[in-house]
Amino acid sequence: MSGLGRSRRGGRSRVDQEERFPQGLWTGVAMRSCPEEQYWDPLLGTCMSCKTICNHQSQRTCAAFCRSLSCRKEQGKFYDHLLRDCISCASICGQHPKQCAYFCENKLRSPVNLPPELRRQRSGEVENNSDNSGRYQGLEHRGSEASPALPGLKLSADQVALVYS
């Protein structure tokens, strides 16, 4: 099925006690009022973990979450929730956020691998890539297409719900 960014009408929010959602899938709250990283599936009549649909084309209801999950799998990148984009740490070392600290500090210890602008920074020729607000520029842009199917997804322990084998 192809991606349909659906927000279906209707649905019922009642669930009986004998129906089991052990990992808190069913929130017991009003329809479409789901916790973060979950979405309301009106045909199932429950909240579902966004992880269930990151492998599917039909993921626009969870697009940002799926992009961030995809991004976190890539070494040297982090997902910026404000920009809603996957950012390459290499492009912002020097004025990097804490998510890039490990990557950038390792890079700085190994100047052979540094891009020219970072080698210049190390020799005192600092280029200011940040704007007035202090946010970084020169980002590696990945648009909404940056949420491909994620076969064989491996998640870290702090990411609740599904772990795909």
Epitope: F21, G45, N55
Partner: antibody, heavy 118, light 107 residues
């Protein structure tokens, strides 16, 4: 290729129980919701309930609560439906069907025929 | 629950005919209407989802239309292998519900 292979036909006595199976292959079993559907001879399709194999969460049609119990076995990628206290009204073909997260059921098992007769 | 009604329970047509099967929902389901084909041996296949989107492997002679409460499935050039019962299903609201089916036969 996605396939749902259901267990063979059952002939059982009234008052007894039966457990039918639906073995999934060609995809990651825990990534999809499995639904069960009933079809009485010459009639339409009636939704029974579903199971989320990754955490065994279930939801049932009111009509089948206490009658059907849905379970799954992740190690064998198999979903099960147990029907209890059988009556002639339970004689039907039962299908398992995979939910595609788009509101439709994209793959179906071949059906298990259940006949309840003394 | 949303009621799905297929007013025509059986339909006779000749090979090569253009055949239209209709389905009505008891309330607005937007475009979340799916069609299934059940062969005489009981095999069920998804034909179309979201009113008009063909499932993989389904011939292009099948098409769907409609919105809201009234929907139709059209077979443009009826072939022998299309002899089956066709069911609609709403995918808009829990619980999923199906139409009663339309059995397609050869004249």
């Amino acid at each position: 290729e996605v396939q749902l292979q259901q267990s063979g036909p059952e002939l059982v006595k009234p008052g007894s129980s039966v457990k039918m199976s639906c073995k999934a292959s060609g995809y990651t079993f825990t990534n999809y919701v499995m639904h069960w559907v009933k079809q009485k001879p010459g009639q339409g399709l009636e939704w029974i309930g579903y199971i989320l194999p990754y955490n065994d969460g279930t939801k049932y049609n009111e009509k089948f609560k206490g009658k059907a119990t849905l379970t799954s076995d992740k190690s064998s990628s198999t979903a099960y439906m147990e029907f209890s206290v059988l009556t002639s009204e339970d004689s039907a073909v039962y299908y398992c069907a995979r939910y595609d997260y788009e509101g439709s059921f994209d793959y179906w098992g071949q059906g298990t025929a259940l006949t309840v007769s003394s | 629950d949303i009621q799905m009604t297929q007013t025509t329970s059986s339909l006779s047509a000749s090979l090569g005919d253009r055949v239209t099967i209709s389905c009505r929902a008891s309330q607005d389901i937007s475009n979340y209407l799916n069609w299934y084909q059940q062969k005489p041996d009981g095999t069920v296949k998804l034909l179309m989802c979201y009113t008009s989107r063909l499932h993989s492997g389904v011939p292009s002679r099948f098409s769907g239309s409609g919105s809201g409460t009234d929907f139709s499935l059209t077979i443009s050039n009826l072939e022998q292998e299309d002899i089956a019962t066709y069911f609609c299903q709403q995918g808009n609201t829990f619980p999923p519900t199906f139409g009663g089916g339309t059995k397609l036969e050869i004249k």
